[in-house]
């Protein structure tokens, strides 16, 4: 896991601002497989490449998210970029972080997890990142990932880095993060739950 997400991000980051805008508009009307919902227009149009990548992965999971991205790129006439994306995702499905088993995303739970729904707010408003990292260490984050997040200079960049690992997490892993958020900044969770 993670390889497809990185490939999607690479593709989207290589789009011009105008192309990214066009990509989003096409995403609003592209045919979807049965059982998949559409990313809400309001949220979609304001996203940067990184936010959009995370949204694609959280809505459609990595494999279908990459396939969908390639279809939209092809529809835009960007065949070479679509081909590169598909080639990158077919190099191997990738693995969960060394030694940490991340089972497939739970299909039993409908909709988005709280941490995916409120990604932008959490990046902007979480201040006690160290608390979260300590709670997730070993259980969800490898030592390497843990140190990578800590190395970031600001709380928002720490949280952004932390969120770069979440596409490989299942629902239970995300629950661990939510639980840690409740312990460290319960008022923030309550505020977001009300919003």
């Amino acid at each position: 896991m993670g390889r497809a997400r990185d490939a999607i991000l690479d593709a989207l980051e290589n789009l011009t601002a105008e192309e990214l805008k066009k990509f989003k508009l096409k995403l609003l009307s592209v045919p979807l497989r049965e059982g998949y919902g559409r990313i809400p227009r309001g949220a979609l149009l304001s996203m940067d490449a990184l936010d959009l990548t995370d949204k694609l992965v959280s809505f459609y999971l990595e494999t279908y998210g990459a396939e969908l991205t390639a279809n939209v790129l092809r529809d835009m006439g960007l065949q070479e970029m679509a081909g590169q994306l598909q080639a990158a995702t077919h190099q191997g499905s990738g693995a969960a972080p060394a030694g940490i088993q991340a089972p497939p995303q739970s299909a039993a739970k409908p909709g988005l997890h709280f941490i995916d729904q409120h990604r932008a707010a959490l990046i902007a408003r979480v201040t006690n990142v160290e608390w979260l990292l300590d709670a997730l260490y070993g259980k969800v984050l490898t030592d390497e990932q843990y140190q990578a997040v800590r190395a970031e200079p600001t709380n928002p960049s720490k949280m952004r880095k932390l969120f770069s690992f979440t596409p490989a997490w299942n629902w239970t892993c995300k629950d661990l993060l939510l639980q840690a958020l409740r312990e460290s900044q319960s008022y923030l969770v309550e505020d977001l739950e009300r919003s």
Epitope: A98, G99, Q101, D134, A135, Y137, G138, K139, D143, Q147
Partner: antibody
Amino acid sequence: EVQLQQSGAELVRPGSSVKMSCKTSGFTFTSYGISWVIQRPEQGLEWIGYIYIRNGYTEYNEKFKGKATLTSDTSSNTAYMQLSNLASEDSAIYFCVRIHRRFFDYWGQGTTLTVSS
Amino acid sequence: DIQMTQTTSSLSASLGDRVTISCSASQGISNYLNWFQQKPNGTVRLLIYYTSSLHSGVPSRFSGSGSGTDYSLTISNLEPEDIATYYCQQYDRLPWTFGGGTKLEIK
């Protein structure tokens, strides 16, 4: 009450292997990690490695890679450490320790290992 | 690896004394420092975690402080049961490392 009960003293021959256990009680085993620490005679403490029970994730001190192997059995709430190719310098007390939020909070009583021919 | 140094290997004090044991790290450890007590019978227990947080069941006469590379454990009113060896340990970076220990004795 949190408890970590370690297996009894071992006397083994050089070149052999040993597997010591750490039976836990008083907490949800799968929510924590178990670390192992060595204390050689008349010396201080040295970290060997740890295992997170929920996912089997392990990290080892480079010095002990190939020497120690950490495993666990969730059905009996027990963590294990196997030491291989034993030599006299492996004679020591070995502690298992619960990890909570990356720090060690509760220690076992220690298992004494003597390697002698 | 981060080296943890306890410069005083043994310390003698009288009952009721205020005792301070110091520990220094070879690089900054962001307050990720624990203090452990090992009794003469070998049992080990956590006293202080994250530099200054008192572990449950530990008497309030124990306290910890420090930042960056320099840390200390203070026992404000020495009691007979405090006879032990005290170890600091960093958990900032792998491999997690311990100081060499400070053996506390009663005068």
